[in-house]
Amino acid sequence: MLKPSLPFTSLLFLQLPLLGVGLNTTILTPNGNEDTTADFFLTTMPTDSLSVSTLPLPEVQCFVFNVEYMNCTWNSSSEPQPTNLTLHYWYKNSDNDKVQKCSHYLFSEEITSGCQLQKKEIHLYQTFVVQLQDPREPRRQATQMLKLQNLVIPWAPENLTLHKLSESQLELNWNNRFLNHCLEHLVQYRTDWDHSWTEQSVDYRHKFSLPSVDGQKRYTFRVRSRFNPLCGSAQHWSEWSHPIHWGSNTSKENPFLFALEAVVISVGSMGLIISLLCVYFWLERTMPRIPTLKNLEDLVTEYHGNFSAWSGVSKGLAESLQPDYSERLCLVSEIPPKGGALGEGPGASPCNQHSPYWAPPCYTLKPET
């Protein structure tokens, strides 16, 4: 039978129901988010019941980890002031129906926030009754009932192995510690080119075959397990196993990486072109213009041979470049007349050339005296 509630005391908190006021309490949802939509309405109760309400105690949530130990936890921070709540438990309708005190509390910031029960204290197929109580206010107590077979969370699958059954068929195998036949599994796999996982449910046999494998792609597999449906009806899955890989390491890169590479190359190329243009314009500004032979005649004519005027070199710099040796003018003719051009012969200058173009003055070095 159900155990009676622990003794009550008369200390009561707030006379809110008499005023018709609702108590809005923030509670934590399983994913850790706050749920403020759950208003704890303090409404009409049976005639003999309390005329004054007590604050509700936090809910207890229990999980049985691989049937090795069980953690029952509560949100200790929901209490209006730090309170070391106590936990008692028993099993309904069984040889284990004696009320037990928690012998191993879990703490959060030095306040009790859970209880850990060891394997010998876990009886999966008997109704587990857990009672949370405020020791300073024993009337504040809450008794919950739980079906532990629906609260089992197995360890993640281990030792994933892949075997090639044929040229295009792969088989994935794995192990689970202790709970093999009680578990169902979920296999997920994808290639480097896939955006999302493909998943496949697998029964207690813990093996999975992939009938058509592309040898050019690299595959990743992972597995998780759940205590369902043969031995219980648990909703929570285990953690994912460590992934295992199969296939060509030289396969085409991930499309995201490929796209990233393309962007980097494009941006890099643009950057290089812009840099070169900057260097070009900088050189254009700082370096003297060097004429092509094609327009040299026009320049010489226009500036009457004044090199510094059209070259962009300042007058001072031009003067400092003046040589301190004597120059010898070399005349250049278009087509030499028969009998040879001026300057030909043994004493002729080596600068004498047959050219249709004007050439810059030809210098003969004269040693300093």
């Epitope: 399983p30 759950a38 208003d39 509700p56 809450a142 008794t143 919950q144 009932m145 909703q235």
Partner: nanobody, 126 residues
């Protein structure tokens, strides 16, 4: 404001059956723990049955195998099917609810419930 209204009580011969209904207004019950309690004249209120919104149902030893708790979220109601009624089942039956975060929470303690109905009388004659 949440309102629970029980119906379906009455006078029945021993061995007979009744189906109690509890309809809610002002709140959706689909994520609440729900319970049935009863109080016989001169006795304390006692737990009869409870249900978590995840679907786990629990019964007091005295009614196990005879009573069945069910809920219909579409109708925002819960039910208690009572078979093989005995004179000791005579009491006022109350429906109660509590908002809960976890699908597995089911309470057998009356002070864990936040809102209650006014009750419906069940009398079993021998």
């Amino acid at each position: 404001q949440v309102q629970l209204v029980e119906s379906g009580g009455g006078l029945v011969q021993a061995g007979g059956s009744l189906r109690l209904s509890c309809a809610a207004s002002g709140r959706t019950l689909s994520r609440d723990a729900m319970g049935w309690f009863r109080q016989a004249p001169g006795k304390e209120r006692e737990f009869v049955a409870a249900d978590s919104w995840g679907g786990d149902t629990f019964y007091a030893d005295s009614v196990e195998g005879r009573f069945t708790f069910s809920r219909d979220n579409a109708k925002n109601a819960v039910y208690l099917q009572m078979n093989s009624l005995q004179p000791e089942d005579t009491a006022v039956y109350y429906c109660a609810g509590a908002p809960t975060s976890f699908a597995t929470t089911a309470y057998s303690s009356s002070n864990s419930y936040r809102y209650w109905g006014q009750g419906t009388q069940v009398t079993v004659s021998s």
